[in-house]
Amino acid sequence: EQAPGTAPCSRGSSWSADLDKCMDCASCRARPHSDFCLGCAAAPPAPFRLLWP
């Protein structure tokens, strides 16, 4: 859950409690089980480049 008082994440990104920051939803293509990916499910990802494990 996002910490109180922090700004909401911008479009195409989602909050990660594991990393304590907003993460680009395109990163879910590299690691689909990242915690922030649940918040990306409804939003289209940003353009992406190479994907690694």
Epitope: D18, D24, S27, R29, A30, P32, F48, W52, P53
Partner: antibody, heavy 120, light 112 residues
């Protein structure tokens, strides 16, 4: 360049604990996950768990919950794994590995491995 | 947990000849985003594992193009078009679909 350098071999008696380290360089420590993998003699690879160094949040394999404890020291860019209540079955090479969560990642990096021998 | 099963256990090869290794997953690794989260690693004797293939068919940086990988959601094949002496070692398939991260049992490739 990215490097993960692990601590040296350890010989321990049954029941003892051991703490092995993985010092990273060449990238921002808090930006990537550090995973730990076990390889028993002549056996395959087995994921133990992983840590997000920036927050200290951890995920463990059920098999290693209570056996392994993962920590990270941001000030020294070093990840640690402590194994408790050692038994002969814990004799293995243990690897740390950098895992990504990003889409613009340039490679897959592993430490050189740390051999832990449990013997009375 | 996703179980990864490899065959054969051991593969004697002749330099210059092709070789292939099979891997099967107990659950489809094809995600709804269209990506198949299957990876191949090679562990050369006395070394740490190194990534060969990511997301089923993409060659990792620096990996020779004699390596290729294909498959469906659950059945995968790693092919070496012409085996070289430096290709010996243990090959592992793995997934990155979810936790826990699991590996196949390995296939030992050795020169005949």
């Amino acid at each position: 360049q990215v490097q993960l350098v692990q601590s040296g071999a350890e010989v321990k008696k049954p029941g003892a604990s051991v703490k092995i380290s993985c010092k990273v360089s060449g990238y921002t420590f808090t930006d990537f996950i550090i995973a730990w993998v076990k390889q028993a003699p002549g056996k395959g690879l087995e994921w133990i768990g992983e840590i997000y160094p920036g927050t200290g949040r951890t995920y463990y394999s059920e098999k290693f919950r209570g056996k392994a404890t993962l920590t990270a020291d941001k000030s020294t860019s070093t990840a640690y794994m402590e194994l408790s209540s050692l038994r002969s079955e814990d004799t293995a090479v243990y690897y740390c590995a950098r895992r990504t969560i990003y889409y613009d990642y340039d490679g897959d990096y592993w430490g050189q491995g740390t051999t832990v021998t449990v013997s009375s | 947990d996703i179980v990864m099963t490899q065959s054969p256990l051991s593969l004697p090869v002749t330099p210059g000849e092709p070789a292939s290794i099979s891997c099967r997953s107990s659950k489809s690794l094809l995600h709804s985003n269209g990506i198949t989260y299957l990876y191949w690693y090679l562990q050369k004797p006395g070394q740490s594992p190194q990534l060969l293939i990511y997301q089923m068919s993409n060659l990792a940086s620096g990996v020779p193009d004699r390596f290729s990988s294909s498959g469906s959601g659950t059945d995968f094949t790693l092919k070496i078009s012409r085996v070289e002496a430096e290709d010996v070692g243990v090959y592992y398939c793995a997934h990155n679909l979810e936790l826990p991260w699991t590996f196949g049992g390995g296939t030992k490739v050795e020169i005949k």
